[in-house]
């Protein structure tokens, strides 16, 4: 029954030209390409991607032709190593060339950068865009392709296809509206920030594979595919999860083609054996492939099966415990998180593999003691304290939400993390409060039956970006340990976390806190970013401070603001009332 | 859907040995729990033996373990239950029992388990 058994290829780069057709080939050479070169310019990457589409196109004319046996790693790797200006724009990246498969696409791997050094997106003006669009489709959705691949180096590929499909069918509708902006914007801003979310859900994934191994990233998929299929069999969910990972397991690294190939047949046998999968993958099954591969891997929760008998039957009571778990631990286990995630979608997925640990944890120590029964009987019990704590830390979290909104929410979050984790830089402390500080506005909506499964998981994909950001510069102990103890455990680690004791407060320095009138052109988000970078430097320079004190300060600031933005002479009333506000603000905080 | 069909029960010796057979359809054997539970005259339904789906765990009652053994065979899609060294308590009609979706856990409770066949009897008297 697996999906992925194939007959072995004289050609596998023909293989997979014929697989995906000449322009899914294409888009995903270049996706590859620039998610490893993310410095190179785009009219390069183009004529890699074109010399490689050439050379696959003589390999299916005769697979037997030179070269055409070369594995993808070794065709793609000699290709990028041919770039002249490796050394000088990647530095020892091009050492990587020096060494042979698989080590040298292990060493590319290494070297992708979560933040690399690269402009800011600016989005041009709608007439603009429209022109270039009609001008040149397919350099305009390369392009898009491109600056996507090369910011996101851990991208999906198979559903930047789809993003990619949307985004030209946002510009084929729009560019002939009557109010083209109107039309558009919307539409660009979607894609934008659910890009954002997409490429964050992946980078977990990829993590968890990379640092934690395979088990880890199964334990996951187990757990969420029994929630969302909670009607499927055991057996038809273990296989899901096999196939499922080798898709991830390609793409985390890199290896595209075979990615896509296989996510689209993972799609094709979901659909086929819908009857034993779930009742809701109808609408799904009927839509072309990239649509239907996003819409399966979105699909909302089937419902239970009515009688689902107790688990404790079979996980506790019965005297065939410790031999099954002797016999077969993973598959045992396996069960275990199958029985109790498909009875609990209201459960965070992380949630569920606590208590999968916990429960690993007590036969461990149980199935070698004298009475294995008597010393696993309450395994359960250990459940509640596990369940509650989340529980209560979303019901606190959502009853501030409601009482500040996002903003000022975001803002609590700020000075609660920075005074937990001070070395990390403000950028990235900003970044990643906004984002936990968006888990209001998008969980706390929800009835307490979806609470947790949509805060605690979101709030793992955000961990994870504060874990990457910061193993790129290593500055703080805590959060190293964190990120790396236990991926189940971060938010519960994080939380824990008290106000660090043995930072020293950062020197005081005026120019941090000096703005200009530019700030006043700043869009909304904009300011909000500027005015919490201010917050966070505030509580680096004043640990101590408290949640009075730094109110009082940015109140004052955000008047500051308002005020100088409405003068005639802005940059003037920014230099004078600026250097008042620094004095105000330092003896307020005692600085 | 599953569908069980015994047979091969009958009278037997004490001492004297016999092989019950369950056929299944619907479903493969291979990946579903099954198992041989029995009932004597005015007794509850107990279990005998089963064996994992998958991974092939066999598990016994402590009344048959050393004598009774099950076994299937994937390629005929069939369970058996070759009884030695029978005694006349092991005297009841014997039914098999399938768990689906459950590749490993075999239950010793009866009413976890949704598919049964309709029973053959085995009385081991001299």
């Known amino acids: 029954r697996g999906v992925f058994r194939r007959d072995a290829h004289k050609s596998e780069v023909a293989h997979r030209f014929k697989d995906l057709g000449e322009e899914n080939f294409k888009a995903l050479v270049l996706i590859a390409f620039a998610q490893y070169l993310q410095q190179c310019p785009f009219e390069d990457h183009v004529k890699l991607v074109n010399e490689v589409t050439e050379f696959a196109k003589t390999c299916v004319a005769d697979e037997s032709a030179e070269n055409c046996d070369k594995s993808l790693h070794t065709l793609f790797g000699d290709k990028l190593c041919t770039v002249a200006t490796l050394r000088e724009t990647y530095g020892e990246m091009a050492d990587c060339c020096a060494k042979q498969e698989p080590e040298r696409n292990e060493c590319f791997l290494q070297h992708k950068d979560d933040n690399p050094n690269l402009p800011r997106l600016v989005r041009p003006e709608v007439d603009v865009m429209c022109t270039a669009f009609h001008d040149n489709e397919e350099t305009f959705l390369k392009k898009y392709l491109y600056e996507i691949a090369r910011r996101h180096p851990y991208f999906y590929a198979p559903e930047l296809l789809f993003f990619a499909k949307r985004y030209k069918a946002a510009f084929t509708e729009c560019c002939q509206a009557a109010d083209k902006a109107a039309c558009l914007l919307p539409k660009l801003d979607e894609l934008r920030d659910e890009g954002k979310a997409s490429s964050a859900k992946q980078r977990l994934k990829c993590a968890s594979l990379q640092k934690f191994g395979e088990r880890a990233f199964k334990a996951w998929a187990v757990a969420r595919l029994s929630q969302r299929f909670p009607k499927a069999e055991f057996a038809e969910v273990s296989k899901l999860v096999t196939d499922l990972t080798k898709v991830h397991t390609e793409c985390c690294h890199g290896d595209l083609l075979e990615c896509a190939d296989d996510r689209a047949d993972l799609a094709k046998y979901i659909c086929e054996n819908q009857d034993s999968i779930s009742s809701k993958l109808k609408e799904c099954c009927e839509k072309p492939l990239l649509e239907k591969s996003h819409c399966i891997a979105e699909v909302e929760n089937d419902e239970m099966p009515a009688d689902l008998p107790s688990l404790a039957a079979d996980f506790v009571e019965s005297k065939d415990v410790c031999k099954n778990y002797a016999e077969a631990k993973d598959v045992f286990l396996g069960m275990f998180l199958y029985e109790y995630a498909r009875r609990h979608p209201d459960y965070s997925v992380v949630l569920l593999l606590r208590l999968a640990k916990t429960y690993e944890t007590t036969l461990e120590k149980c199935c070698a003691a004298a009475d294995p029964h008597e010393c696993y009987a309450k395994v359960f019990d250990e459940f509640k304290p596990l369940v509650e704590e989340p529980q209560n830390l979303i019901k606190q979290n959502c009853e501030l939400f409601e009482q500040l909104g996002e903003y000022k929410f975001q803002n609590a979050l700020l000075v609660r993390y920075t005074k937990k984790v001070p070395q990390v830089s403000t950028p990235t402390l900003v970044e990643v409060s906004r984002n936990l500080g968006k888990v209001g506005s998008k969980c706390c909506k929800h009835p307490e039956a979806k609470r947790m499964p949509c805060a605690e998981d979101y709030l793992s994909v955000v961990l994870n970006q504060l874990c990457v950001l910061h193993e790129k510069t290593p500055v703080s102990d805590r959060v190293t340990k964190c990120c790396t103890e236990s991926l189940v455990n971060r938010r519960p680690c994080f939380s824990a976390l008290e106000v660090d004791e043995t930072y020293v407060p950062k020197e005081f320095n005026a120019e941090t806190f000096t703005f200009h009138a530019d700030i006043c052109t700043l869009s909304e988000k904009e300011r909000q970013i500027k005015k919490q970078t201010a917050l966070v430097e505030l509580v680096k320079h004043k640990p101590k401070a408290t949640k009075e004190q730094l109110k009082a300060v940015m109140d004052d600031f955000a008047a500051f603001v308002e005020k100088c933005c409405k003068a005639d002479d802005k940059e003037t009333c920014f230099a004078e009332e600026g250097k008042k506000l620094v004095a105000a603000s330092q003896a307020a905080l005692g600085l | 859907e599953v569908q069980l069909l015994e047979s091969g029960g009958g009278l037997v010796q004490p001492g004297g040995s016999l092989r019950l057979s369950c056929a299944a359809s619907?479903?493969?054997?291979?990946?579903?729990?099954v198992a041989w539970f029995r009932q004597a005259p005015g007794k509850e339904r107990e279990f005998v033996a089963g064996?994992?789906?998958?991974?092939?765990?066999?598990y016994y009652a402590d009344s048959v373990k050393g004598r009774f053994t099950i076994s299937r065979d994937n390629s005929k899609n069939t369970l058996y239950l070759q009884m030695n060294s029978l005694r006349p308590e092991d005297t009841a009609v014997y039914y098999c029992?399938?768990?689906?979706?459950?590749?490993?856990?075999?239950?010793?409770?009866?009413?976890?388990?949704?598919?049964w066949g309709q029973g053959t009897l085995v009385t081991v008297s001299s």
């Open positions: 029992a399938a768990r689906p979706g459950r590749p490993l856990i075999t239950s010793r409770v009866a009413n976890l388990y949704p598919y």
């Open positions: 619907g479903r493969y054997i291979d990946s579903t729990a």
């Open positions: 064996i994992g789906g998958g991974v092939d765990i066999t």
